[in-house]
């Protein structure tokens, strides 16, 4: 499978809510011996590989925000911890995987990464990730609502798979 990022850039006004989205593409094994681990984190655009570094989102680590389930099951973070920080990650039956951030501030601007790992009994992990930029703006130049910019078809297909 691969991960696609439908949008590569989100431009939002301060105070708004935003939902960043990744999508699993391709066949997803739903067997009893496979588990999917999905999470979000902030990162930096590395010279060699984007999304290598795992920084917290609003002080929550990638482990605080992770989802853990089989196949295309739906899941979401029930952590009070995440919700207290205005965050919720969720996954639906169709391969969509998102994080919602409430009441954005300028400090939320940056690069965000989704990570999906297929974990199988006796097999090495299959790891894929996607990246997107969030720009939070204030003042008269800020949009009234979030504006999203689609990834180019090349970007959404050329996702790192390790």
């Amino acid at each position: 499978f691969k991960v696609a990022t439908p949008y590569s850039l989100y431009v939002c006004p301060e105070g708004q809510n935003v939902t960043l989205t990744c999508r699993l593409l391709g066949p997803v094994d739903k067997g009893h011996d496979v588990t999917f681990y999905k999470t979000w984190y902030r990162s930096s655009r590395g010279e060699v590989q984007t999304c290598s570094e795992r920084r917290p989102i609003r002080n929550l680590t990638f482990q605080d925000l992770h989802l853990h389930h089989g196949g295309h099951q739906a899941a979401n973070t029930s952590h009070d911890l995440a919700q207290r920080h205005g965050l919720e990650s969720a996954s639906d039956h169709h391969g969509n995987f998102s994080i919602t951030m409430r009441n954005l501030t300028l400090l939320d601007s940056g690069l965000y990464c989704c990570l999906v790992v297929e974990i199988r009994h006796h097999h090495s992990e299959h790891r894929v990730h996607g990246a997107m930029e969030l720009q939070v703006q204030t003042g008269k130049d800020a949009p009234s609502n979030c504006v999203v910019y689609p990834s180019s078809s090349q970007d959404s297909e050329n996702i790192t798979a390790a």
Partner: antibody, heavy 119, light 107 residues
Framework: QLQLQESGPGLVKPSETLSLTCTVS??????????WGWIRQPPGKGLEWIGS???????YYNPSLKSRVTISVDTSKNQASLKLNSVTTADTAVYYC???????????WGQGTLVTVSS | DIQMTQSPSSLSASVGDRVTITCRAS??????LAWYQQKPEKAPKSLIY???SLQSGVPSRFSGSGSGTDFTLTISSLQPEDFATYYC?????????FGQGTKLEIK
Amino acid sequence: QLQLQESGPGLVKPSETLSLTCTVSGGSISSSGYYWGWIRQPPGKGLEWIGSLYSSGYTYYNPSLKSRVTISVDTSKNQASLKLNSVTTADTAVYYCARHPVAMNFDDWGQGTLVTVSS
Amino acid sequence: DIQMTQSPSSLSASVGDRVTITCRASQGISSWLAWYQQKPEKAPKSLIYAASSLQSGVPSRFSGSGSGTDFTLTISSLQPEDFATYYCQQYNSYPYTFGQGTKLEIK
């Protein structure tokens, strides 16, 4: 703060089974998204990964040891265990338990315990 | 199995020196490489993950670089507490493997 503590016999006879326990404090061994692994280091030598167990129960072993090794967890005791059977003197080493998150390296280690195989 | 080869196997340096240790993988491992520091009678301590990302709490004089098969660990200005043995480890695929170690000694 997470702490890992290995325990078990310091001396095992050749052909017998080496059994070690890793007791986890400051966190739950059943937390999803983590592996519990064992690494060993013969005296004066380098590190060798023995195997890991994922929170959902999946196991991963080094092929060089696979026929002799079993890693398991006891969630009620918050412990991981290592069993290595048919030991020889080549299995003399410091044995470490360690934790690693999904798609990450070993970020928390126990202090290690020396196991000597000798008659 | 992926073989990890470190060089040099030992190194003598002085406080304040800049030191570089290299690690080569027998096949490509993307950026799935970690560096550890180990002092005598102690467990290894993670310094770098994902080839170049500093583990929380590790001094910024440590840095890592590389991707694919060739990687380096650099200590920009050696401190007395940095004299130890350093190991690289690939976590691209099982079985996870370590380099043979580089012992950093005081000149």
